[in-house]
């Protein structure tokens, strides 16, 4: 039978290219059976993950899965970095893989790099 443990479906080493100034939603897909767990987002600073306290978050419910969403409205250059979601379930802490946002600073619309250009040049962001 299917496990009733909470599972967080962020892929290992997932990455996103996003533009400063745009809105962006970072999703943490959560599978649970009965009671929805308490979920939080944190941002990695070296080996420490710093909890994001004062950020807009929301839940989106779908048939087989729920999404805990961290809102960036808008994306800022210092949003660049790696994030992780965590769930408290039966006094256990379940951590997701980290996901990395590569923020490209806003240029004029005509100079904006394509998604593929951004994907191929993450070192520009450091």
């Amino acid at each position: 039978k299917e496990s009733c443990d909470v599972q967080l479906y962020i892929k290992r080493q997932s990455e996103h290219s996003i533009l400063a100034g745009d809105p962006f939603e970072l999703e943490c897909p959560v599978k649970y059976c009965a009671n929805r767990p308490h979920v939080t987002w944190c941002k990695l600073n070296g080996t420490t993950c710093v909890k994001l306290e004062d950020r807009q978050t929301s839940w989106k419910e779908e048939k087989n899965i729920s999404f805990f969403i961290l809102h960036f409205e808008p994306v800022l250059p210092n949003d660049n970095g790696s994030y992780r979601c965590s769930a408290n379930f039966q006094s256990n802490l379940i951590e997701s893989h980290s996901t990395t946002l590569y923020v490209t600073d806003v240029k004029s619309a005509s100079e904006r790099p394509s998604k593929d250009e951004m994907a191929s040049r993450p070192w520009l962001l450091y």
Epitope: Y9, R12, S14, H97, K115, D116, A119
Partner: antibody, heavy 119, light 112 residues
Framework: QVQLVQSGAEVKKPGSSVKVSCKAS????????MYWVRQAPGQGLEWIGR????????RYAQKFQGRATITADESTSTAYMELSSLRSEDTAVYYC????????????WGQGTLVTVSS | DIQMTQSPSSLSASVGDRVTITCRSS???????????LNWLQQKPGKAPKRLIY???KLDSGVPSRFSGSGSGTDFTLTISSLQPEDFATYYC?????????FGQGTKLEIK
């Protein structure tokens, strides 16, 4: 079970481009990463790059940066690898592969596509 | 880039032999999640590679139990406890910890 089927062999002129396709079945590719590896005749394996089909983010080995383009079409469960400015040293079998993005619980390779670059 | 070095590059053995192939990485493959992303592939002539082992020691489904993997940090081994005729092939290690992914140069296992 997860399966990958690649497009057929290609013969190309130096300086031209080739685009190889790789169609997945038995898996939702949003939950995977798809990657490309090549093998020159009698040689070892060389990683070209990978794509996250969920968001289109592609990552490349530096050697292929700017010359390889990996894309994915979620609606057809197909990944593509285009290699431009072909030279004779690009003659190789090109493999696509797919693996589970969460737990790495599966890793399946396509049958390979022979690309021959010759004038 | 992480360099992956396999030894030996070729090996002659007989059916029933116990065989060990080693793989050394130029830096630790231990990821921040505490796992080492070291895989072993088998490739037969004219065929696509097939993953045998992942996360150092986990066997892929359908892989016979005579195959085993071990190691940590930078040193890893693939062991075949009792060679069968279908095991004669080329074996590659490769790392999935850092980008770019990198492969060992391969070990060709031949019949003595």
């Amino acid at each position: 079970q997860v399966q990958l089927v690649q497009s057929g062999a290609e013969v190309k002129k130096p300086g031209s481009s080739v685009k190889v396709s790789c169609k997945a079945s038995g898996v939702n590719i949003k939950d995977t990463y798809m990657y490309w590896v090549r093998q020159a005749p009698g040689q070892g394996l060389e990683w070209i790059g990978r794509i996250d089909p969920a968001n289109g983010y592609a990552r490349y080995a530096q050697k292929f940066q700017g010359r390889a383009t990996i894309t994915a079409d979620e609606s057809t469960s197909t990944a593509y690898m285009e290699l431009s400015s072909l030279r004779s040293e690009d003659t190789a079998v090109y493999y696509c592969a797919v693996y589970d993005g969460y737990y790495e619980s599966f890793d399946v390779w396509g049958q390979g596509t022979l690309v021959t670059v010759s004038s | 880039d992480i360099q992956m070095t396999q030894s030996p590059s070729s090996l002659s053995a007989s059916v029933g032999d116990r065989v060990t192939i080693t793989c050394r990485s130029s830096q630790s493959l231990l990821d921040s999640d505490g796992k080492s992303y070291l895989n072993w592939l088998q490739q037969k002539p004219g065929k696509a590679p097939k993953r045998l082992i992942y996360l150092v020691s986990k066997l892929d489904s359908g892989v016979p139990s005579r195959f085993s993997g071990s190691g940590s940090g930078t040193d890893f081994t693939l062991t075949i406890s009792s060679l069968q005729p279908e095991d004669f092939a080329t074996y590659y290690c490769w790392q999935g910890t850092l980008f770019p992914r990198t492969f060992g140069q391969g070990t060709k296992l031949e019949i003595k």
